[in-house]
C-alpha cells in the first residue's frame, strides 16, 4: 500500500468541490515562505477520467491569481503526476473526502529534490481538528514541526474566493 489510505472508497469524485488550505510543510523553507513557489492555496478540485483537476490561488503582486492544474493518474491509485515548477510525484497520504485531505509531493526541479506537504479542509472552522494528523504524517515522512507553516486567512487568498 502506498500511503495511509489509497483513493477514497467512493472514488476520486468524492474529492470534488471546495477546499481550503490550512497548512504547508517542506524541507526547503523557501518553497513555502511568502512568494515561495509552493505557497499556493487550493480553491476547488474535480476529478475526471481518474485525473485530479485543481483550481489553485497563487499570490502575485498583492493579488491572487487563479490557476488550473491537472494531476494525471498513474498506475498507482494514490499517486499522480503534476507538472508545476518542475515535475512532482503527488501522493494522497490521508483522505477523508468530507473533511480533510493530506497530500505530499516529491518535487524535482533541475537537479534538486524537495518534499512538500499540504493540509486542506472542507470547513475552515474545523482546521484545528486536523492539524495533529498533518503533523503526524509530516513527522513520518521526515518533516518536522518547525518546518510546518499554518496559514492565516490573509495568507490563503480568502479575499479572492467566490
Amino acid at each position: 500500500q502506498e500511503g495511509n489510505h489509497e483513493e477514497p472508497q467512493g472514488g476520486l469524485e468524492e474529492l470534488s468541490g471546495r477546499w481550503h488550505s490550512v497548512a504547508l510543510a517542506s524541507n526547503k523553507s523557501d518553497l513555502i515562505k511568502p512568494w515561495g513557489h509552493f505557497r499556493v492555496f487550493i480553491h476547488s478540485m474535480s476529478a475526471k477520467d481518474g485525473n485530479l483537476h485543481g483550481d489553485i490561488l497563487i499570490p502575485q503582486d498583492g493579488q491572487c491569481e487563479k490557476v488550473s492544474l491537472t494531476a494525471f493518474k498513474t498506475a498507482t491509485s494514490n499517486k499522480f503526476d503534476l507538472e508545476y515548477w518542475g515535475h512532482n510525484d503527488l501522493y494522497l497520504a490521508e483522505v477523508d473526502p468530507k473533511s480533510y485531505l493530506i497530500l505530499y509531493m516529491i518535487n524535482q526541479y533541475n537537479d534538486d529534490t524537495s518534499l512538500v506537504a499540504h493540509l486542506m479542509v472542507r470547513d475552515l472552522s474545523r482546521q484545528q481538528d486536523f492539524l495533529p494528523a498533518f503533523e503526524s504524517v509530516c513527522e513520518d515522512i521526515g518533516l518536522h514541526k518547525d518546518q510546518i507553516v499554518v496559514l492565516s486567512d490573509d495568507d490563503r487568498c480568502q479575499g479572492s474566493r467566490d
Epitope: Q1, E2, G3, N4, N27, Y91, A93, Y104, I106, T113, L115, V137, E139, D140, I141, G142, L143
Partner: nanobody
Amino acid sequence: EVQLVESGGGLVQAGGSLRLSCAASGRTFSEYIMGWFRQAPGKERVFVSTISKSGAITNYADSVQGRFTISRDNAKNTVYLQMNSLKPEDSAVYYCAAGPLLSPAGRQYDYWGQGTQVTVSS
C-alpha cells in the same frame, strides 16, 4: 552512526522471488526513513523504494511497482524488500539506505549498506 547490513541476495530464475533484508544497528532505527536502491554493472545507482518511519507510507520506482514490496519491523530494526516476478533487468547490487527524508534522491540518505547481489537468469 547507523550500520546497515543487507542479506538475502542470490541467483534466481526469471519469474522467481527473493526477499532482501537490511539489519540496522546504532541509533534509533525508527527515527529514519529507509530506502532501497540498486546499481547494475556500468550504470548509476537508482532508486527502488522507500518507506516512512512508521511504515505507513511507501513509494516505489515505476519499474518495480506492483512487483516489489517494502516493509519494516521497527522492533527488529530491519527493513525488507520482497521481490516477486523478477526479471533479468532486475539484476543488480541492491543497497539499503537510511536518511531523514522520504525521497527518491540518493543524496538525501546519510547511511548506506555494502550491498547484496541479485542475479536473475533468463
